[in-house]
């Protein structure tokens, strides 16, 4: 795969992943009411990082924001922080990678600068993806713990009042946002890795092991090794450099925008 293609594909994959991370962060369905083995209720509860919602069979949906910071579980705060850090790093990664794209010429920026920027954006995307994956996984772990705790409570009869009145404990299971977050984090991570791989090909290493040849009068050609130039260590293949005339031009102009999916 050519450097341009690898870099471009890495950028697009990261962009899709980043859009997914934003979508997952905004979605309300991080946890949804567990309907299995439960009395069928005419009310469906689901929760996000920022608000909890209730959808009635009447079609009426009511969402309430978490207007407190102190009263929220530390784990939820941590997940919020991880997702926001992931988004911030993703934004920086996108901005850096736009300037690093081989198919865009900006001023007199040389390939070594583009290589460094590509590596930087790749690392940013990798960290962004990891943040999202960790955030979603922490939330999922919290759900699993709470699920089994509430299951134990249901079967130990803690909800009942003297055995006369039954109360139904709402149990929550994985919501769509978790799956979106995992996939998005994975895509961002993969895109970042591709950007790092593309960086190898962008490294100006044509001076590595350069040999100087000269002709001695009537003698055979002799070779003398030139001075060894320290390289990035990513390889020593010399690449042909394409030069694009004109201003900044992109091969990928379309940008995917995150859409918030809401139950109606």
């Amino acid at each position: 795969m050519s450097v341009t293609a690898c870099q471009g594909l890495g950028f697009v994959v990261s962009l899709i992943g980043f859009a997914g991370i934003i979508a997952a962060t905004c979605m309300d369905q991080w946890s949804t009411q567990d309907l299995y083995n439960n009395p069928v209720t005419a009310v469906f509860n689901y929760q996000g990082l920022w608000r909890s919602c209730v959808r009635e069979s009447s079609g009426f949906t009511e969402c309430r924001g978490y207007f407190t910071l102190l009263g929220l579980p530390a784990m939820l705060q941590a997940v919020r922080a991880l997702m926001i850090v992931g988004i911030v790093l993703g934004v920086i990664g996108i901005l850096v990678s736009i300037f690093a794209l081989k198919c865009i010429r900006i001023g007199s920026m040389d390939d070594s600068a583009k290589a460094k920027m590509t590596l930087t954006s790749g690392i940013l995307f990798i960290i962004s993806g990891i943040c999202a994956i960790i955030g979603v996984s922490v939330f999922a772990n919290m759900l699993v713990t709470n699920f089994w705790m509430s299951t134990a409570n249901m079967y130990s009869g803690m909800g009942g009042m003297g055995g006369m009145v039954q109360t139904v404990q709402t149990r929550y299971t994985f919501g769509a946002a978790l799956f979106v977050g995992w996939v998005a984090g994975g895509l961002t991570l993969i895109g970042g890795v591709m950007m790092c791989i593309a960086c190898r090909g962008l490294t100006p290493d044509d001076s590595n092991f350069k040999a100087v040849s000269y002709h001695a009068s009537g003698q055979n050609v002799a070779y003398r090794p030139g001075g060894f130039k320290a390289s990035t260590g990513f390889g020593s293949n010399t690449r042909n450099k394409k030069i694009y005339d004109g201003g900044a031009r992109t091969e990928d102009d379309e940008q995917s925008h995150p859409t918030k999916y809401d139950y109606v």
Epitope: T41, A42, N45, V54, S58, F60
Partner: antibody
């Protein structure tokens, strides 16, 4: 304004079937559930089931499964309830109602009296 | 199924006096997601369909006089008519709107003493 108009009273023989209609107007028919309620003479209210006119999805009270079949026709904004294998205990006033906030029934049809008599 | 039990079965109250009807459910009708109780109250006069008075246990339906009020949470609910009027003579039903199948109380007949 929201209106639910039900079909007229019916007198049926035991073992036969009856189809009661409920024509809705004044709102987007597909967007709200239609519920059916039975009230036997001098008795209380009993929920039969509901239909989502948009999707055609139904939910029945176990007691009325096999007895009642609820359908809806979006083109005419009409919900139907068919009662099969009629018996004397099916004699009642049947109401259709539109769901509202809190899953409550804010709008009701005028009721259809079904009399099962030999 | 959820059992809704109303008390009393019938009630005679003087005009202008307070009338109180109780309703108990066999399971809590409180939804933790929005902290709302899914219980409705209806008024039915002879030969008429029921009329919605209260939903979410305490929210008055538009057009319903403010002498009607609902209260309670979980399994115990109350409908109160603060000052009985002649037109309030009817049968009152509470309804579980939380669990399928939706179930009604047996009804309370309210009369004037």
């Amino acid at each position: 304004q929201v209106q639910l108009v039900q079909s007229g009273a019916e007198v049926k023989k035991p073992g036969s079937s009856v189809k009661v209609s409920c024509k809705a107007s004044g709102y987007a028919f597909s967007n709200y559930l239609i519920e059916w309620v039975k009230q036997a003479p001098g008795q209380g209210l009993e929920w039969i089931g509901l239909i989502n006119p948009g999707s055609g999805g139904t939910n029945y009270n176990e007691k009325f499964k096999g007895k009642a079949t609820i359908t809806a026709d979006k083109s005419t904004s009409t919900a139907y309830m068919e009662l099969s294998s009629l018996r004397s205990e099916d004699t009642a006033v049947y109401y259709c109602a539109r769901v509202y906030y809190g899953n409550s029934f804010a709008y009701w049809g005028q009721g259809t009296l079904v009399t099962v008599s030999s | 199924d959820i059992v809704m039990t109303q008390s009393p079965d019938s009630l005679a109250v003087s005009l202008g006096e307070r009338a109180t009807i109780s309703c108990k459910s066999s399971q809590s009708l409180l939804n933790s997601g929005n902290n709302k109780n899914y219980l409705a109250w209806y008024q039915q006069k002879p030969g008429q369909p029921p009329k919605l008075l209260i939903y979410w246990a305490s929210t008055r339906e538009s057009g319903v006089p403010d002498r009607f009020s609902g209260s309670g949470s979980g399994t115990d609910f109350t409908l109160t008519i603060s000052s009985l009027q002649a037109e309030d003579v009817a049968v009152y039903y509470c309804q579980n709107d939380y669990f399928y199948p939706f179930t009604f109380g047996q009804g309370t007949k309210l009369e004037i003493k």
